[in-house]
Amino acid sequence: APVPPGEDSKDVAAPHRQPLTSSERIDKQIRYILDGISALRKETCNKSNMCESSKEALAENNLNLPKMAEKDGCFQSGFNEETCLVKIITGLLEFEVYLEYLQNRFESSEEQARAVQMSTKVLIQFLQKKAKNLDAITTPDPTTNASLLTKLQAQNQWLQDMTTHLILRSFKEFLQSSLRALRQM
C-alpha cells in the first residue's frame, strides 16, 4: 500500500497498481450505475407490484425511452464503433430528464437516486472525451424536457409508479447494451 506523506524518506508514495485506462474506467462507471439501479429497483418492487404487472404497455406508450436498435451499430452484427458511441451518448443525454423525474420518487433511497443521476452525468463526460465526432451528438431541448417532466409529474399515482419502474428497467437494458458494445471498442 502507498505510504502517506511524511512517513517515508522521499515524502511521496509509490503507486501500488496500474493507472486506470479510459475503457476500464468507463466499464467500472457503468457497473457502478447498474448497482445503483438495482438498489432503486429493489425499493420500487417492494413498494408496489409494478415489477410483475402486465399493464406496462399502457404506460410505455407515453414514454419515449431510448432503446438500442440495429441501425445504431451497437450490436455484434453490423457493429460500428463511431455510430454506436454517438448513440450511447445521445441515449444517455435523453435519459437525463427521466433520471431527474426519479429524484422525488424514492423515500428510503433518495441518496441512491441522486447518485445514479450524478454518476450518469460523469459517464457522459467520460464518453464525450472518448468520442471523436461530437457534432453528431444531439442534445435534448431543455424546453421539451421541462414540459415532459411536468407531464410525467402530473400523472396519477399508479402511472407514476409504473413510469418509475419502466425508466429503471429501460435504463438498465440500455446500460447493459452499452457495456457490451463498449467492451468491443
Epitope: 502507498p2 467500472k28 457502478y32 447518485a115 445514479v116
Partner: nanobody
C-alpha cells in the same frame, strides 16, 4: 512517470483566499477520487476535503466547512480546492491524493479522509496564513 502536482500555495493574510489545484501526469485524474490533506507544524496530517469520481459527492471536515470548496474541472482534468476566509490555523503543508475507493456503489464519503486508501500522493505545497 505517474505523479500528482499541485499549484497555488503561498503566503496570504488572515481573511484572504487561495486556490490550490491538483493535476496528474501519466494518468487521468478524472478517473480518480481526490482527497486534500494538510499537515500543520508539529501536528498529525488531517484530511480536510474530498470529491468522488463516480458521482461527484463531496466531503468537508468541520474545520473547513463553509470556507473551502472542492471542485473538478473535466476540461483541464484537475481538482481544485478554493480556500476562503483563511485563518492562521490553516497554515501547513497541503497534499492532494488520488484513489479508487469510490467505485463501489454505496461507499461512505465521510470515510474519504480517514480509512480509505489512496494510490497516488503529491509532494505537498506550503500554505502560510499570517499578517
Amino acid at each position: 512517470q505517474l505523479q500528482l502536482a499541485e499549484t497555488g500555495g503561498g503566503l496570504v493574510q488572515p481573511g484572504g483566499s487561495l486556490r490550490l489545484s491538483c493535476a496528474a501526469s501519466g494518468f487521468t485524474l478524472d478517473y480518480y477520487a481526490v482527497g486534500w490533506f494538510r499537515q500543520a507544524p508539529g501536528k498529525e496530517r488531517e484530511g480536510i476535503s474530498c470529491i468522488s469520481s463516480s458521482d461527484l459527492k463531496t466531503y468537508y471536515a468541520d474545520s473547513v466547512k463553509g470556507r473551502f470548496t472542492i471542485s473538478r474541472d473535466y476540461a483541464k482534468s484537475t481538482v481544485s480546492l478554493q480556500m476562503n476566509s483563511l485563518k492562521p490555523e490553516d497554515t501547513g503543508v497541503y497534499y492532494c491524493a488520488a484513489g479508487t475507493w469510490d467505485l463501489k456503489f454505496g461507499y461512505n464519503i465521510s470515510a474519504c479522509v480517514g480509512s480509505y486508501e489512496y494510490d497516488y500522493w503529491d509532494q505537498g505545497t506550503q500554505v502560510t496564513v499570517s499578517s
